[in-house]
C-alpha cells in the first residue's frame, strides 16, 4: 500500500500585488490523522501561514471546505498579497500526537509577487545654473518586483544618453528600487524645457510611468544690458534708458548711479515675456543736465536672482 503523498502541483505562482494567491495542495490519503499546515520557507525559521487544526489566519481561506468528510484538497488562498509575501510555500502533513509531528512535506511552491514601481520622482540641483553648464537630475522609483526594469531619460522628447542607473539591492529581495542620475547641458532656450524620466516594468502593461522636472526650476539666464541716451525731452533734461533683456527668473533689482552715487533703485515689475520664456524689462532715468557743470557717468547696475551685480555705463556729455 502506498504511503500518503503531499502534492503541490505548481512549482511557481506569480501574483500581482493586491490580488489573492491560490496555492494548491492535495494529499493522496486521509491517513495518518493529523492536520495540514502551510509554511513559508523551510528549516527552523519557517513561518506558519495556516494550521488546519488551530489558530486564526485572517488573510488565509481554504479553497475547498476543509471540514468536508473526504476532503483531500488543502489548497489555500492568501488575500491582499504584498511583495513581503514572496517566498517558497510548503504544504506539510502532520501526524496527530502530543505534539503533532511532521509526517510529509510537499515540494514547495514559489510565490513571486509582481509589484508596480512607484511614480518616478525627478529632482534637480539645489541651486540654479546658467546656460552651457551641465546639471544633474536624479530619478527614483521604489517597491517594484520582479527586478527587471527599464529607465529612459528625455529632454523635450529627445532621448538622453548621458546617465547612470542602479537597481538595488543587487541580490534577491521582495522588492527593488531604481536610482538614476542624468547629466543635462543647459541652453538659453531651456526655460520651457522639461526633463522626463520614464520607467517601464512588466506590471505596467506597456504603459510606462513618467516623472518630470521643469528646467524653469533649474536654469538661470543672466540678462544682457544696454544703456542708451534718448533725444532731449526738454531744454535741460536727458532721458537715459537701460534695456534689460533675456533674463530668467524674474527676480531682478536695478540701481541707477550718477557719477558713482545711487540715484534710484527699483525692482522689475511690468516685464514682457519672450517666446522662449525669458523676460525683458526697461528702466529709464531723467537727468537734469543744468545741475551738472561737467560730464556725467551714468551706470545701470543690475542684481539678478541674488547673483553679483552686472552693470553698464554711459557717459553723458554736458556742453558748456
Amino acid at each position: 500500500e502506498e504511503e500518503l503523498q503531499v502534492i503541490q502541483p505548481d512549482k511557481s505562482v506569480s501574483v500581482a500585488a493586491g490580488e489573492s494567491a491560490i496555492l494548491h495542495c492535495t494529499v493522496t490519503s486521509l491517513i495518518p490523522v493529523g492536520p495540514i499546515q502551510w509554511f513559508r520557507g523551510a528549516g527552523p525559521a519557517r513561518e506558519l501561514i495556516y494550521n488546519q487544526k488551530e489558530g486564526h489566519f485572517p488573510r488565509v481561506t481554504t479553497v475547498s471546505e476543509s471540514t468536508k468528510r473526504e476532503n483531500m484538497d488543502f489548497s489555500i488562498s492568501i488575500s491582499n498579497i504584498t511583495p513581503a509575501d514572496a517566498g517558497t510555500y510548503y504544504c506539510v502533513k502532520f501526524r496527530k500526537g502530543s505534539p503533532d509531528t511532521e509526517f510529509k512535506s510537499g515540494a514547495g511552491t514559489e510565490l513571486s509577487v509582481r509589484a508596480k514601481p512607484s511614480a518616478p520622482v525627478v529632482s534637480g540641483p539645489a541651486a540654479r545654473a546658467t546656460p552651457q553648464h551641465t546639471v544633474s537630475f536624479t530619478c527614483e522609483s521604489h517597491g517594484f518586483s520582479p527586478r527587471d526594469i527599464t529607465l529612459k531619460w528625455f529632454k523635450n522628447g529627445n532621448e538622453l544618453s548621458d546617465f547612470q542607473t542602479n537597481v538595488d539591492p543587487v541580490g534577491e529581495s521582495v522588492s527593488y528600487s531604481i536610482h538614476s542620475t542624468a547629466k543635462v547641458v543647459l541652453t538659453r532656450e531651456d526655460v520651457h524645457s522639461q526633463v522626463i524620466c520614464e520607467v517601464a516594468h512588466v506590471t505596467l502593461q506597456g504603459d510606462p510611468l513618467r516623472g518630470t522636472a521643469n528646467l524653469s526650476e533649474t536654469i538661470r539666464v543672466p540678462p544682457t544690458l544696454e544703456v542708451t541716451q534718448q533725444p532731449v525731452r526738454a531744454e535741460n533734461q536727458v532721458n537715459v534708458t537701460c534695456q534689460v533683456r533675456k533674463f530668467y527668473p524674474q527676480r531682478l533689482q536695478l540701481t541707477w548711479l550718477e557719477n558713482g552715487n545711487v540715484s534710484r533703485t527699483e525692482t522689475a515689475s511690468t516685464v514682457t515675456e519672450n517666446k522662449d520664456g525669458t523676460y525683458n524689462w526697461m528702466s529709464w532715468l531723467l537727468v537734469n543736465v543744468s545741475a551738472h557743470r561737467d560730464d556725467v557717468k551714468l551706470t545701470c547696475q543690475v542684481e539678478h536672482d541674488g547673483q553679483p551685480a552686472v552693470s553698464k555705463s554711459h557717459d553723458l556729455k554736458v556742453s558748456a
Partner: antibody
Framework: RQLVESGGGLVQPGGSLRLSCAAS????????ISWVRQAPGKGLEWVGT?????ITYYASWAKGRFTGSKTSSTAYLQMTSLRAEDTAVYYC????????????WGQGTLVTVSS | DIVMTQSPSSLSASVGDRVTITCQAS????????LAWYQQKPGQAPKLLIY???TLATGVPSRFSGSGSGTDFTLTISSLQPEDFATYYC???????????FGQGTKVEIK
C-alpha cells in the same frame, strides 16, 4: 458503499480469531479502518485503527494481542490470547477519527470467547 | 487516556421535544474539536451524526446540531422525531493517536 464483516464465532479462551472487513463501492487505500466493539448490553469501545504500513494504533488494552492490516479492499483484525471479556460484536468502520470520522460501518460480527 | 462522561445516561422525551445531551472530556480533546456523535438503534451499527464537534454529517437531518469546544460538548435535537429514539454516543480523541474513547451512551426513550 458498504463494509461487510466476517470471521466471528465461538472461540476458546487463549485462542485466536481473524476478522475480515470487505469494502465494496470504495477503496480502502486512502482511508483508515477502525475497529469498534460492543459487549452484550454495553456501550461502544474503540479497539484500534489500521492505516498504512506503520500507521496502526490500538487502545492500550488491545496492544500486543490485537493486530490489524489491510489491502485496498479488505481490512483484517487478528485477535490472539482471547479472554471471556473480549466477547462482543466487532464492527469495522471507515475512518480514523478527528476530521476523518467513522462514517461507514459494517453490520458487525459476534465473537464469543467461552470454554 | 481521555475519559468521556455523558449525561444523562438516559432520558424520556416526547415527539417534538427539544433534547440536549452533554459530553465532558477529562482533558481538552485534540484540536479542541475532536468530538463526534453517533446514533445507535437496537440491533444496528452506529451511525455518524456530527463530527469536528459541530459539522453535520452528510444526510443527517438539520434538527441535529453539535456545539462545544475543549472539554464540554453538547448534542441537541431541536424537535424530537419518532425515528430519533435511540442511544447516542460521543467519541472523543485525545492528543495521542491511540487515545479515542466513547462516552458510556445516553438512551433516549419515549415518555
Amino acid at each position: 458503499r458498504q463494509l461487510v464483516e466476517s470471521g466471528g464465532g465461538l472461540v476458546q479462551p487463549g485462542g485466536s480469531l481473524r476478522l475480515s472487513c470487505a469494502a465494496s463501492g470504495f477503496s480502502l487505500s486512502s482511508h483508515g479502518i477502525s475497529w469498534v466493539r460492543q459487549a452484550p448490553g454495553k456501550g461502544l469501545e474503540w479497539v484500534g485503527t489500521i492505516g498504512t504500513g506503520v500507521i496502526t494504533y490500538y487502545a492500550s488494552w488491545a496492544k500486543g494481542r490485537f493486530t490489524g492490516s489491510k489491502t485496498s479492499s479488505t481490512a483484517y483484525l487478528q485477535m490472539t490470547s482471547l479472554r471471556a471479556e473480549d466477547t462482543a460484536v466487532y464492527y469495522c468502520a471507515r475512518g480514523s477519527a478527528w476530521n476523518d470520522p467513522f462514517d461507514y460501518w459494517g453490520q458487525g460480527t459476534l465473537v464469543t470467547v467461552s470454554s | 487516556d481521555i475519559v468521556m462522561t455523558q449525561s444523562p445516561s438516559s432520558l424520556s422525551a416526547s415527539v417534538g421535544d427539544r433534547v440536549t445531551i452533554t459530553c465532558q472530556a477529562s482533558q481538552s480533546v485534540y484540536g479542541n474539536n475532536d468530538l463526534a456523535w453517533y446514533q445507535q438503534k437496537p440491533g444496528q451499527a452506529p451511525k455518524l451524526l456530527i463530527y469536528l464537534a459541530s459539522t453535520l454529517a452528510t444526510g443527517v437531518p438539520s434538527r441535529f446540531s453539535g456545539s462545544g469546544s475543549g472539554t464540554d460538548f453538547t448534542l441537541t435535537i431541536s424537535s424530537l422525531q419518532p425515528e430519533d429514539f435511540a442511544t447516542y454516543y460521543c467519541l472523543g480523541g485525545g492528543d495521542d493517536e491511540a487515545d479515542n474513547t466513547f462516552g458510556q451512551g445516553t438512551k433516549v426513550e419515549i415518555k
